[in-house]
């Protein structure tokens, strides 16, 4: 996923929400797979910022070499820096590992902007602030890269948590999470709580700040409020979902819902922004501008390029609308909505802000590869990747940034007919899985 706006962080037909309450589903509490309740050893195991990605500490090799690894639900390779690079503090030294096995195979991953390439092997891998297990996993040792590593990001590799279908060089390369589940008794589920700062952090603060939690094997109830709502994973490649309706401050964009998912909609922790297909982006920006029309901002701001700065503490959050995405529910003709605040989609930029100013970038941008629900969406929610039941859950995050007037929300159910029609069917070609550009 390339955060850049792919961080790697890569920044309709639905009927009106009649408010008709469908019969409550069987309480999901009794049905969730995995360990329940508290995963205290995994809470707060992520660090980072939405603009440069969230990373977890991992160890590779014997004796263990510690590296910080970007958590990326938009790709499927475990790849680590394995040669000196100006932006890397440390890198994986295969020659020092007695358990390294060379697969004698190369891998090349191009992005829209930039690329990485390396050599495939396997080694022993563990997550110090994760489950108490060690697994043998495929590792791509990155030997050359361009515009991949980010100066000052503090991570040295990437953990692709999506499915084998999009692994490089092909789907025969087992992703890390598949290896983990196969080799241990860990349930096939993980969950992410990404905690945006909500205010600019300088370098020292950023390194010291808590970024969130990756819970491997289950759900931690301390990380969310309210209930979890689930949307089906449409296809196991990316974490693909279906959006059935989009609202800005409660106003329906009134587009054919296929447009929202053209050519797919994915949940991607390795992308900074909420990225929307061109037509949807244009309609959304028009609506956001109209909702905040008491102020006028420069054209470059809406392109995600210029920063708008307010005197510290005076950001007028109230003039910006909320954005609601309605997702297909688990029950026929039922949807639920997730609502984010400007505190999520206006991203604080640390390097230009002074003690006098709070500066922000507009973190909704245009995409040619479908909707990408990146960090700015995920920072509002606790997101459960329930692979075992082929579904993704959303609940209001206990750490999301809000104000005294509005909060992020996950609400439902809403009656929405013909939701299956909202999915876009990508014409199958041999090249279809080669589109990894995440800029």
């Amino acid at each position: 996923t390339h955060l850049g706006i792919r961080l790697p962080l890569r920044s309709g037909l639905a009927g009106p929400p009649l408010g008709l309450r469908l019969p409550r589903e069987t309480d999901e509490e009794s049905e969730e797979p995995g360990r329940r309740g508290s995963f205290v050893e995994m809470v707060d195991n992520l660090r980072g910022k939405s603009g440069q990605g969230y990373y977890v500490e991992m160890t590779v090799g014997s004796p263990p070499q510690t590296l910080n690894i970007l958590v990326d639900t938009g790709s499927s390779n475990f790849a680590v820096g394995a040669a000196p690079h100006p932006f890397l503090h440390r890198y994986y030294q295969r020659q020092l590992s007695s358990t390294y096995r060379d697969l004698r195979k190369g891998v090349y991953v191009p992005y829209t902007q930039g690329k990485w390439e390396g050599e495939l092997g396997t080694d022993l891998v563990s997550i110090p602030h994760g489950p108490n297990v060690t697994v043998r996993a495929n590792i791509a040792a990155i030997t050359e890269s361009d515009k991949f590593f980010i100066n000052g990001s503090n991570w040295e590799g990437i953990l692709g948590l999506a499915y084998a279908e999009i692994a490089r060089p092909d789907d025969s390369l087992e992703p890390f999470f598949d290896s983990l589940v196969k080799q241990t008794h860990i349930p096939n589920i993980f969950s992410l709580q990404l905690c945006g700062a909500g205010f600019p952090l300088n370098q020292t603060e950023a390194l010291a700040s808590v970024g969130g939690s990756m819970i491997i094997g289950g759900i931690d109830h301390s990380l969310y409020t309210g209930r979890l709502w689930y949307t089906p994973i449409r296809r196991e490649w990316y974490y693909e979902v279906i959006i059935v309706r989009v609202e800005i401050n409660g106003q329906d964009l009134k587009m054919d819902c296929k447009e929202y998912n053209y050519d797919k909609s994915i949940v991607d922790s390795g992308t900074t922004n909420l990225r929307l297909p061109k037509k949807v982006f244009e309609a959304a920006v028009k609506s956001i501008k109209a909702a905040s029309s008491t102020e006028k901002f420069p054209d470059g701001f809406w392109l995600g390029e210029q920063l708008v700065c307010w005197q510290a503490g005076t950001t007028p959050w109230n003039i910006f609308p909320v954005i609601s995405l309605y997702l297909m529910g688990e029950v026929t003709n039922q949807s639920f909505r997730i609502t984010i605040l400007p505190q999520q989609y206006l991203r604080p930029v640390e390097d230009v802000a002074t003690s006098q100013d709070d500066c922000y970038k507009f973190a909704v941008s245009q995409s040619s590869t479908g909707t990408v629900m990146g960090a700015v969406i995920m920072e509002g929610f606790y997101v459960v990747f329930d692979r075992a039941r082929k579904r993704i859950g959303f609940a209001v995050s206990a750490c999301h940034v809000h104000d005294e007037f509005r909060t992020a929300a996950v609400e439902g159910p809403f009656v929405t007919a013909d939701m299956e029609d909202c999915g876009y069917n990508i014409p199958q070609t041999d090249e279809s899985t080669l589109m990894t550009g995440r800029a």
Epitope: P298, G300, Q306, L307, V308, V352
Partner: antibody, heavy 120, light 108 residues
Framework: QLQLQESGPGLVKPSETLSLTCTVS??????????WGWIRQPPGKGLEWIGM???????WYNPSLKSRVTISVDTSKNQFSLKLSSVTAADTAVYYC????????????WGRGTLVTVSS | EIVLTQSPATLSLSPGERATLSCRAS??????LAWYQQKPGQAPRLLIY???KRATGIPARFSGSGSGTDFTLTISSLEPEDFAVYYC??????????FGGGTKVEIK
């Protein structure tokens, strides 16, 4: 052709309020693509942005002057105004009004400027 | 806060010569930079915006280049009316309040 013209007293006493008006001719101040701003230049020195206003009344000020500055707009007269309170000799400058265009970022059209001297 | 540093402070050249003025930002401003010309007793005039786009009515001898932190205004062949003070301004951070200190181009 759009033109901007500053007007107001050329001499203001210390501690008093400096008041200037910019009259826009040849076009409407209510056209939505522009902010309207004030910039000053002390004698022999560089340019200092004071603040700007949108026709809706939305204002942005230089933090270093914010406590003393008020910019207002009168769309019926096609004018916008600057008030700077509690002036001192350091506020002596040529005051320019300007249009903020080109994607609402750059000062693409300027008035001729008016010299305001603060002296008793 | 982003600081713009212009150099040299004064440039002494003859008509017909090429003038190269520099503006350096303390951190990246992408391509959101403008150049203004100010003649004695006159208001500034926008010459270049977005680092390299000429404003309406500006002669082709004026050109701007650069992105990130280093920017250049070039006057390919100085005309007598080009002797003036030139200011750069960044608008990467908005509102547009940051100007450089100016470069005076004087007749040698």
């Amino acid at each position: 052709q759009l033109q901007l013209q500053e007007s107001g007293p050329g001499l203001v006493k210390p501690s008093e309020t400096l008041s200037l008006t910019c009259t826009v001719s040849g076009g409407s101040i209510s056209r939505g693509s522009y902010y309207w701003g004030w910039i000053r230049q002390p004698p022999g020195k560089g340019l200092e942005w004071i603040g700007m206003i949108y026709y809706s009344g939305s204002t942005w000020y230089n933090p270093s002057l914010k406590s003393r500055v008020t910019i207002s707009v009168d769309t019926s007269k096609n004018q916008f105004s600057l008030k700077l309170s509690s002036v001192t000799a350091a506020d002596t400058a040529v005051y320019y009004c300007a249009r903020v265009g080109h994607g609402i970022s750059y000062f693409d059209l300027w008035g001729r400027g008016t010299l305001v001297t603060v002296s008793s | 806060e982003i600081v713009l540093t212009q150099s040299p402070a004064t440039l002494s050249l003859s008509p017909g010569e090429r003038a190269t003025l520099s503006c350096r930002a303390s951190q990246s401003v992408s391509s959101y930079l403008a150049w203004y010309q100010q003649k004695p007793g006159q208001a500034p005039r926008l010459l270049i915006y977005d680092a390299s786009k000429r404003a309406t009515g500006i002669p082709a001898r004026f050109s701007g280049s650069g992105s990130g932190t280093d920017f250049t205004l070039t006057i390919s062949s100085l005309e007598p009316e080009d002797f003036a003070v030139y200011y750069c301004q960044q608008v990467y951070t908005w509102p547009p309040r940051t100007f450089g200190g100016g470069t005076k181009v004087e007749i040698k």
